[in-house]
């Protein structure tokens, strides 16, 4: 049995512009005021951190300036958007949620969202 329950969609298809959005929802045992959300990518047996943000409940998520992620929060729900994706980035994206404050610390891991990215076909030259 996992710790805190975290739900995320099983599959998401990235747009032709390489943008994928999904909701990560967690069941908080109590009234957390500081939450950390991390997106992890699992490919084969390798897990790498894609992006992370800490936010105060009621405030916006703030990712680093050079992050490929953006997001908004509403209650126990986080809307995540990953940009700049290419076909090679297809994989399982796991949402990790940590309740940082007040103590006690709680952790939850989602089952992952399989994001499929298809590189757009280059436009053929057209003669008019």
């Amino acid at each position: 049995c996992k710790a805190m329950h975290v739900a995320q969609p099983a599959v998401v298809l990235a747009s032709s512009r390489g943008i994928a959005s999904f909701v990560c929802e967690y069941a908080s045992p109590g009234k957390a005021t500081e939450v950390r959300v991390t997106v992890l990518r699992q490919a084969d047996s390798q897990v790498t951190e894609v992006c992370a943000a800490t936010y105060m409940m009621g405030n916006e998520l703030t990712f680093l300036d050079d992050s490929i992620c953006t997001g908004t929060s509403s209650g126990n729900q986080v809307n995540l958007t990953i940009q700049g994706l290419r076909a090679m980035d297809t994989g399982l994206y796991i949402c990790k949620v940590e309740l940082m404050y007040p103590p006690p610390y709680y952790l939850g891991i989602g089952n992952g969202t399989q994001i499929y990215v298809i590189d757009p076909e280059p436009c053929p030259d057209s003669d008019f």
Epitope: P29, L40, P104, L107
Partner: antibody, heavy 115, light 107 residues
């Protein structure tokens, strides 16, 4: 100040029962999952049982070594968590700690199982 | 069940030295790891939570690192007061298993 105060330990014969209690103050009891963890010289720290809170339907979890013999329960109105221990064995001996999440720990109560 | 393997089982170092204790999980625990300090005759105290976060009231000489299956606890500039047994614990999934402990002594 956070306080977790365990009581109910002592000497008990193998096969008999014992009930531990833990009264909590200083943090919001109903917002938290409560655990019992035991410490013995042979096994070090060993998690025993967990009870979650209302948002998690008061789900309970047990280590394989105590499943079917121990029962964890809670009374949110009294900020108290309990551990009912039946059919006690020599290997159940140790200091039993009540924990809030795994952040806050009580001072422990000693359980001795001996004929 | 996730197994936690801690090493070394015991360790002796001099005041002022830096020591490292390691903890390995039998599978990826995604940073779901706590470290505890238990002094003789006292209750365990949370030292590090979520692999890297220092618990309230604990000295900044303690630091945690690691990810995946491998984690470590570093104690810098060892003090006599650091004599204790240190435990790691999986906090990702039940059963919430502990490592076997590392007993730290001062030379």
């Amino acid at each position: 100040e956070v306080k977790l105060d365990e009581t109910g330990g002592g000497l008990v014969q193998p096969g008999r029962s014992m009930k531990l209690s833990c009264v909590v103050s200083g943090f919001t009891f109903s917002d938290n999952w409560m655990n019992w963890v035991r410490q013995s010289p042979e096994k070090g720290l060993e998690w025993v049982a967990q009870i979650r809170n209302k948002p998690y339907n008061f789900e309970t979890y047990y280590s394989d070594s105590v499943k079917g013999r121990f029962t964890i329960s809670r009374d949110d109105s009294k900020s108290t968590v309990y551990l009912q221990m039946n059919n006690l064995r020599a290997e159940d001996m140790g200091v039993y700690y009540c924990t809030g999440g795994f952040t806050y720990w009580g001072q422990g109560t000693l359980v001795t199982v001996s004929a | 069940d996730i197994q936690m393997t801690q090493s070394p089982a015991s360790l002796s170092a001099s005041v002022g030295e830096t020591v490292t204790i390691t903890c390995g999980a039998s599978e990826n625990i995604y940073g779901g790891l706590n470290w505890y300090q238990r002094k003789q005759g006292k209750s365990p105290q949370l030292l590090i939570y979520g692999a890297t976060n220092l618990a309230e009231g604990m000295s900044s000489r303690f630091s945690g690192s690691g990810s995946g299956r491998q984690y470590s606890l570093k104690i810098s500039s060892l003090h006599p007061d650091d004599v204790a047994t240190y435990y790691c614990q999986n906090v990702l999934s039940s059963p919430w298993t502990f490592g076997g402990g590392t007993k730290l002594e001062i030379k």
